[in-house]
Amino acid sequence: MKVLQEPTCVSDYMSISTCEWKMNGPTNCSTELRLLYQLVFLLSEAHTCIPENNGGAGCVCHLLMDDVVSADNYTLDLWAGQQLLWKGSFKPSEHVKPRAPGNLTVHTNVSDTLLLTWSNPYPPDNYLYNHLTYAVNIWSENDPADFRIYNVTYLEPSLRIAASTLKSGISYRARVRAWAQCYNTTWSEWSPSTKWHNSYREPFEQH
């Protein structure tokens, strides 16, 4: 039994780090493998993560952590019974993938303006709470070419756009994702999408 693709890990900078790897053949990850992780810190203990299958030869493990600070560094040991398959380390603050925003809502009752709001996925005491910026994706269900991205570079989790920038009388969907420049994070996953019917009064044309 050998590791084909070494574990790579990302942290949500809150309570979970996710490690993925591939074995050299079909593996029952949860029964055959264990990923041990230990904070490099005085009097810390090793903790065990039981991996799940992620495709035939792929495994994924969700490492539970109390919280994360920039100094944290973990040793990782991948075991198959008594055999050490791989040894590595992981610094969560250098591999951050933020949590996805939630509760995306489209408010259509503000004159001819669309107000999109969503929730910051972090509590106020988390460092990332005040460092997230967002990308909002809006697309038409009827026209695949009608696809746009709005970059929200301010901290407030909201976006206002004129309803008239979208076509009237058709359905649109929106989703939002986040990233944090301070830790050079990857983008989060997209939030679940929300749907609305776009309708607004066309201005009278004067001849």
């Epitope: 904070l39 005085l42 009097l43 203990e45 090793a46 539970l64 952590m65 109390d66 919280d67 100094a71």
Partner: antibody, heavy 125, light 112 residues
Framework: EVQLVESGGGLEQPGGSLRLSCAGS????????MTWVRQAPGKGLEWVSS????????YYADSVKGRFTISRDNSKNTLYLQMNSLRAEDTAVYYC??????????????????WGQGTTVTVSS | DIVMTQSPLSLPVTPGEPASISCRSS???????????VDWYLQKSGQSPQLLIY???KRASGVPDRFSGSGSGTDFTLKISRVEAEDVGFYYC?????????FGQGTKLEIK
Amino acid sequence: EVQLVESGGGLEQPGGSLRLSCAGSGFTFRDFAMTWVRQAPGKGLEWVSSISGSGSSTYYADSVKGRFTISRDNSKNTLYLQMNSLRAEDTAVYYCAKDRLSVTVRPRYYGLDVWGQGTTVTVSS
Amino acid sequence: DIVMTQSPLSLPVTPGEPASISCRSSQSVLYSIGYNYVDWYLQKSGQSPQLLIYLGNKRASGVPDRFSGSGSGTDFTLKISRVEAEDVGFYYCMQSLTSPYTFGQGTKLEIK
């Protein structure tokens, strides 16, 4: 009431051995790291050794490394310090102390918040 | 090893007056923001040491609020706002970020 009670001290000749014990009560003993600190007569405090809650991690002062062994029996809520090859400079009052909560991924530190009454070790011929 | 240096080593104080003890570490004991691994202990004559302050500025349970700790990185201070007769004894700072834990030499607080 959270309490630590040391025992096992006494008079021993240079080169001899002693085993100190520290019985814990009033807290979940296995969840906490434990530490030994000593104090030579008329001197300040000196850290001796520490052990994590499960016993998997141990640390020693250079002055005792290779001679002293820290261990614990969580089923008996007891901490030990096996002292071999004793020297005159090991003469001191030995205290055990409750250290950080070590079952969490990052050990949670609240200081050495409970200390035993101390047990006296005298090494003399 | 991290060396902890206390000053003064002797501190005569009039009851009701404030007192301050300094502790300097030879390297930073800051792990992350809010986590300075420095404690302060008081050892009264014939007794075991007792914890006063942990993580630089957190008062231990049951410790009177006249005791406070401050500082970050390498420089730390224990302050007693109004010294009482029962506060006499030896005060020690200690770092517990890395092994070996190291103590300051101790400061003897006595009543004038």
